[in-house]
């Protein structure tokens, strides 16, 4: 029995993170006895809900425990029977529902609510559906990057946990690109912030951190996208939208009413002569750029630097995670090597914009037309968003690490927000016990 | 906590403009937008219009449409309603109010007189 | 426009007596399964205060005896028992559509 491995005391967690575009269900285990340590937590599970994000089921609240189901029962199977009661679960809900908020209270509380009673029939330890903050988002993204990398450790290692990690201690900064909104989170040089509501402080594992974080309500691709559109149609002549961000050869009819359901178009408004237009692409990159520029404000700054929109951005300081949509798409167009550089990045784009969409979907049969149609746009957005928006230049690029996973878990905000929400980041260092006392006899 | 706090009390000839503002506290501004209602002496509350401080769009009530304008600055955290061609009826307590379709956080009010 | 009608104008109760403000509007104001009514209270050199949302639901810190019932197009305000500081001007509101509408508002006293 000398070397017999006792069963280990282990423990899980879940979050459903309801993006905008859809919700994911992210399953998290960790040994009991070593909570408090860093980097102990990974993921075992992520499920991915079929259909869109919860915002969208204002019209179908009905449907929203269906919706929930498979996810929910694929937790029920990976986490032991045993275990189902003490797992808690937490719903956060970003900028889609910060939106439908936006929009009406009544609408985003009637989907959190019939969110909050499905989830409560399953038995687990649910601890509530909420819409997390723009901030919130931004440093729980943070904290997961840098928890995932090790940055929080004290033990200094010989060897390297993931390929990007240096040794030292200097936390990565946290990009991160949703359908709906996107965050820029990290530690700056200089201490002192010129914006106090850009400002926060942790005590994490014995150390102080002063971060910088804001998140671009209504900046995340999709409604990045829909601002373009309803400012490119104010200009068109008729009811044909000549577009430089897809593909030459595409065809897409919208509604009028589509485009100004959401308040991120509403600077954009105005009444036209129809009801439907054509989206007609061109293909053209160049040209894409400089539309998507337009929807940065650069022209006024209260603060010595600012991003855009007059929203203060400190210069920015170190290594870089870019994860989410921004890894999902620059892995689509397979530019997510460290080698890449920024101008060969942008030479592949225009390449890749200016192909016929014919070509297109030949070459990527297999991906729906919906999100294909859309990696021309996105993938210019994301450069003008990380250049012209926050200011990266072509060498400060090699700084930028396109992540999905770190060791198995997908970079995100929704480890850390556990972690937070189960008290597992002491703010103090834990004490080093000398041995674990339950791995071997 | 939320706070609206309001400039204070105005006194205008008629024919003349006011710029009332409204600065928010205890919350994300841009999460938010801020609607303005008046109320005249022994009136029912009118509804003028509201931003989205998050862009700076904005939708009026068809009677104030040319009249009111609606901005913010969002780095002072603060919107602004502007009433120009003022007329004795416009004498009013002018509030603002955080919401989507629910005003749970109104400011102390603001009390414009047209006076000649 | 959407039209909210207020009954009564004014209305004077005992303390610890029941209070019933109704409010019609010209039109339907649900949608998505939601009642787009709300309830406020207004006291003299003081902005109105929500009591009520969504019809039924009570506001943030607002006393149990206030509640709220309806839908489509009449609604109710109903003081349970009423407190000499309920005395007060309520008004009922309609955000289903632009322009947001009030009602002309009842002035509840104590008898």
């Known amino acids: 029995t000398q070397n017999k491995a006792l069963p280990e005391n282990i423990k899980y967690g879940i979050v459903l993170d309801a993006g905008s575009s859809h919700t994911s269900l992210y399953i998290y285990k960790w040994p009991a006895e070593k909570e408090n340590d860093t980097g102990v937590v990974h993921q075992v599970e992520e499920c991915r809900v079929k259909g869109p994000g919860i915002s969208k089921y204002v019209q179908k609240v009905n449907e929203i425990g269906i919706y929930l189901t498979d996810c929910m029962e694929r937790a029920r199977e990976v986490i032991p029977r045993s275990q189902h009661q003490e797992t808690p679960v937490y719903l956060g809900a970003t900028a889609g529902m910060r939106l439908l908020r936006m929009e009406s209270e009544e609408l985003a509380d009637r989907v959190l609510d019939v969110v909050e009673r499905s989830l409560s029939n399953y038995p687990f330890d649910f601890q509530g559906a909420r819409i997390i903050t723009g901030q919130e988002e931004g440093a729980y993204g943070w904290i997961t990057i840098n928890y995932l990398l090790g940055k929080f450790s004290q033990k200094t290692r010989w060897f390297s946990i993931v390929p990007y990690e240096t040794n030292n201690q200097e936390t990565f900064g946290a990009l991160d690109l949703g359908g709906a909104s996107t965050q820029i989170t990290f530690v700056p040089q200089n201490q002192t912030t010129e914006s106090p509501d850009n400002a926060l402080q942790f005590r994490l594992y014995g150390k102080d951190y002063n971060v910088y974080t804001h998140s671009f309500l209504c900046y995340g691709k999709d409604q990045a996208l829909w601002q373009k559109l309803a400012k490119d149609i104010q200009v068109a002549s008729n009811e044909i939208l000549r577009d430089p961000c897809f593909h030459p050869g595409y065809k897409k009819v919208v509604n009028v009413s589509d485009l100004y359901k959401t308040p991120c178009t509403k600077r954009f408004e105005m009444t036209l002569p129809f009801q439907q237009f054509e989206i007609q692409g061109i293909g053209n990159y160049q040209q894409c750029h400089q539309s998507v520029l337009e929807l940065f404000n650069t022209s006024y700054c209260p603060y010595s630097q600012c991003a855009f929109n007059g929203i203060f951005l400190p210069p920015l300081q170190g290594d870089f995670g870019a994860f989410s949509a921004f890894y999902f798409v620059m892995n689509f167009l397979n530019l997510t090597s460290e080698k890449v550089s920024q101008e060969k990045v942008t030479e592949m784009m225009k390449k890749f914009c200016s192909q016929p969409w014919e070509e297109i979907k030949t070459s990527y049969a297999g991906v729906k037309e919906k999100y294909l149609s859309e990696y021309c746009f996105s993938g210019t957005y994301i450069l003008s968003l990380l250049l012209q928006g926050y200011h990266f230049t072509a060498d400060s690029w090699e700084h930028i690490h396109f992540i999905g996973k770190i060791q198995g878990s997908d970079a995100g905000w929704t480890l850390g927000y556990m972690l937070n929400l189960t008290n597992m980041i002491p703010a103090e260092q834990p004490l080093s016990t000398p041995l674990s006392h339950s791995t071997y006899v | 906590q939320v706070q609206l706090v309001q400039s204070g009390a105005e006194v205008k000839k008629p024919g003349a403009s006011v710029k009332v503002s409204c600065k928010a506290s205890?919350?994300?501004?841009?999460?938010?937008?801020m609607h303005w209602v008046r109320q005249a002496p022994g009136q029912r509350l009118e509804w003028i219009g509201y931003?989205?401080?998050?862009?700076?769009?904005?939708t009026f009530n068809q009677k104030f449409k040319g009249r009111a304008t609606i901005t913010v600055d969002t780095s002072a955290r603060t919107a602004y309603m502007e009433l120009s061609s003022l007329r004795s009826e416009d004498t009013a307590v002018y509030y603002c109010?955080?919401?989507?379709?629910?005003?749970?956080?109104w400011g102390q009010g603001t009390l414009v007189t047209v006076s000649s | 426009d959407i039209v909210m009608t207020q009954s009564p104008d004014s209305l004077a109760v005992s303390l610890g007596e029941r209070a019933t403000i109704n409010c019609r509007a010209s039109?339907?104001?649900?949608?998505?399964?939601?009642?787009?009514m709300y309830w406020y209270q207004q006291k003299p050199g003081q902005p109105p205060k929500l009591l009520i949302y969504?019809?039924?639901n009570q506001g943030s810190g607002v006393p149990d005896r206030f509640s709220g019932s309806g839908s489509g197009t009449d609604f109710t305000l109903t003081i349970s028992s009423l407190q000499a500081e309920d005395v007060a001007v309520y008004y009922c509101?309609?955000?289903?559509?632009?322009?947001?509408?009030f009602g002309g508002g009842t002035k509840v006293e104590i008898k």
């Open positions: 509101q309609q955000t289903k559509e632009v322009p947001y509408t």
């Open positions: 039109e339907s104001v649900d949608n998505f399964g939601v009642s787009f």
């Open positions: 969504g019809a039924s």
């Open positions: 931003i989205v401080p998050l862009n700076g769009g904005s």
């Open positions: 109010a955080r919401g989507g379709t629910r005003f749970a956080y």
């Open positions: 205890g919350y994300t501004f841009t999460d938010y937008n």
